[in-house]
Interface confidence: low
């Protein structure tokens, strides 16, 4: 008779990424007998929750339960019922909630209270909802991509082809861009990390890593746009803002009260003689780039070298995975190919931003106008942040790999977060050789 595989002995885990603009639920799966091996956990499902980020629910906390229902029900379907009770669920909220907490601890806690109550109603092993720090967000993103790339393993990987493979075990740096913050994390080469706040020490699979990380709150793409608008409206002579970061012919009315709602624009706040202003796009990449650069204070640095705003940044080292909005925006602009040079990216951005709004709307009829209108800004912002903010150059640009998924798992902090909380990253190399993927009798 033919050999039959024994029933799969697998485990599941759920992580909700409560970002500033939306919430996503990720389901992970791994062979139970290989928990401590590197690279065996993989994503089986991503469910994007319909609606905004949880920080937008301050005025309607009672709607949070319904908001989370569809994705939690999806998790119920995907994970076998027999596994429900032992499947951990974690919710990590990022910069959107950090900003809300800056405005009001009470409001942030109220939102988290309701989130916790809602998630506790499901048959899973709910482990809590919390606002993760920027340092954690950076660190877990770095762990995720290096785990998926097999960088922590001294053994042959169980999967066949690793994308972006280099011949050595040097880890990749991680570049993460969200709506409200951006993180840069990497192992510097023989460089003292001059600022203790930016230093992390890990021992993973028997090897020590001295990691640099920083999270720039308010420098995610959405908050950076609010900052830029708040800065530019200061010098507008009337309620018309001619903006080079939007396509020619684009028009949008912005409420001043919305502009000053976020703590990110506080430094630009002033009494304006109008309640609303109108953005009128003029679509000029170079001027947009110049306007964005004014958000980065590079005149002050208390260390040997800085990124911006006086934040220490060691010399860049090795290859980097750029994910989340770095990837989504560049993918939309068709600029993720390894073959596209930085000069080519700049050239393409100049052309894209100069295209009339009516033409853009026709070319991308299926894309929501709110998102479509902001790709010129977002693409320009990514270039400005990487080149002037983090000091990548035209030649080090080729070391940036825009990554959406690695081996079917999304690049981002959630997998690293779960691996850590479920103790699946051992400090030392596991002694025994793990069993093969499935055992036959």
């Amino acid at each position: 008779t033919q050999n039959k595989a024994l029933p799969e002995n697998v485990k599941y885990g759920i992580v909700l990424d409560a970002g500033s603009s939306h919430t996503s639920l990720y389901i992970y799966k791994w062979p139970a007998e290989k928990e401590n091996d590197t690279g065996v956990v993989h994503q089986v499902e991503e469910c994007r929750v319909a609606g905004p980020g949880i920080s937008k629910f301050v005025q309607k906390v009672n709607a949070i339960g319904i908001y989370l229902t569809a994705c939690m029900e999806r998790a119920r379907e995907v994970i076998p019922r027999s596994q429900h009770q032992e499947t951990p669920v974690y919710l990590g909220a990022t910069a959107g909630m950090r900003l809300l907490r800056m405005e009001s601890e009470e409001l942030a806690d109220r939102v988290l209270d309701v989130v916790e109550r809602s998630l506790s109603n499901y048959p899973f092993d709910f482990q809590g909802a919390r606002i993760i720090t920027g340092q954690e967000e950076g660190a877990y993103g770095w762990i995720t991509i290096n785990y998926l790339l097999g960088k922590f393993s001294q053994k042959t990987r169980w999967f066949s082809i690793v994308p972006y493979e280099t011949n050595n075990q040097e880890t990749f740096g991680a570049l993460d861009l969200g709506g409200a913050s951006t993180q840069v994390t990497f192992v510097p080469q023989n460089q003292t990390i001059e600022s203790p706040d930016n230093a992390l020490q890990f021992r993973l699979y028997g090897k020590d890593y001295n990691v640099y990380t920083h999270s720039f709150l308010c420098y995610g793409k959405d908050q950076a746009l609010w900052q830029k608008l708040a800065k530019d409206i200061q010098v507008a002579s009337n309620e018309i803002l001619r903006d080079p970061c939007f396509h020619p012919g684009y028009k949008k009315v912005v409420n001043v009260s919305d502009l000053y709602k976020t703590p990110c624009t506080k430094r630009f706040e002033m009494t304006l003689p109008f309640q609303q202003f109108e953005i009128q796009g003029i679509g000029n990449y170079q001027q947009c780039h110049q306007s964005i650069l004014e958000l980065f204070n590079t005149s002050y640095c208390p260390y040997s070298q800085c990124a911006f705003n006086g934040i220490f940044l060691p010399p860049l080292q090795g290859d980097f995975g750029a994910f989340s909005a770095f990837y989504f925006v560049m993918k939309f602009l068709n600029l993720t190919s390894e073959k596209v040079s930085q000069e080519k990216v700049t050239e393409m951005m100049k052309k894209f931003c100069a295209q009339p709004w009516e033409e853009i709307k026709t070319s991308y009829a299926g894309v929501k106008e709110k998102y479509l209108s902001e790709y010129c800004f977002s693409g320009t912002y990514i270039l400005s942040l990487l080149l002037q903010g983090y000091h990548f150059t035209a030649d080090s640009w080729e070391h940036i790999h825009f990554i959406g998924k690695i081996q079917g798992s999304d690049a981002g902090w959630t997998l690293g977060y779960m691996l850590n909380l479920t103790n699946m990253i051992p400090a030392e190399q596991p002694l025994s050789t793990p069993l093969s993927h499935s055992t036959y009798v």
Partner: antibody, heavy 116, light 111 residues
């Protein structure tokens, strides 16, 4: 279980300074701001300010600016408050209390007595 | 600063009866549809204990006989039925804006 353990009573002379501590356990220290409250007989409870353990950022009641300095040591999960240029007006019980919705967790208080 | 005026300054209530303490704010403590008003109980030699948050939500482990109500500028704490263990000082507090402020307190005793 959330616990905030405060340092013992202090008897200090006018003009001197005092530093008290508040050691946290039972929760992730950096997830919550630490607030300080003064309790004296004449004026009831007064909020002094808070510190964000993530970055050491502080927010003070204007009344206590220059009087109180808040600091933290994240590795030992301890918050500190230093009071300077003490006068008899500063004789009181000082509480640390964890931030977030509702000050549900309080230290037992540190009694400061200013006397020549 | 938001000033909280608490009344009465002291109150004596018979066991089993209702005690009502009021707190008036000099300006609204509502934000995003939530009232940032809190009620604390404090006994001699002990730290304050949270009874009510967000004007009407009971704190963890607080007996059902404690209830809070109100919005905007006018709030009240009700204790019914009064028990011997409820003898204490009661404070209202707002955390809508910095500086957070407390009421001057109400001393509750048994008649």
């Amino acid at each position: 279980e959330v616990q905030l353990q405060q340092s013992g009573p202090e008897l200090v002379k006018p003009g001197a300074s005092v530093r008290m501590s508040c050691k946290a356990s039972g929760y992730t220290f950096t997830d919550y701001n630490m607030h300080w409250v003064k309790k004296n007989h004449g004026k009831g409870l007064e909020w002094i300010g808070y510190i964000n353990p993530n970055n050491g950022g502080t927010t003070y009641n204007q009344k206590f600016k220059g009087k109180a300095t808040l600091t933290v040591n994240t590795s030992s999960k301890t918050a500190y408050m230093e009071l300077r240029s003490l006068t008899s007006e500063d004789s009181a019980v000082y509480y640390c209390t964890r931030g977030g919705t509702r000050f549900a967790s309080w230290g037992q208080g540190t009694l400061v007595t200013v006397s020549a | 600063n938001i000033v909280l005026t608490q009344s009465p300054a002291s109150l004596a209530v018979s066991l089993g009866q209702r005690a009502t303490i009021s707190c008036r704010a000099s300006e609204s403590v509502d934000n995003y549809g939530i009232s940032f008003m809190y009620w604390f109980q404090q006994k001699p030699g002990q730290p304050p204990k949270l009874l009510i948050y967000a004007a009407s939500t009971q704190g963890s482990g607080v007996p059902a006989r404690f209830s809070g109500s109100g919005s905007g500028t006018d709030f009240s704490l009700n204790i019914h039925p009064m028990e011997e263990d409820d003898t204490a000082m009661y404070f209202c507090q707002q955390s809508k804006e910095v500086p957070f402020t407390f009421g001057s307190g109400t001393k509750l005793e048994i008649k």
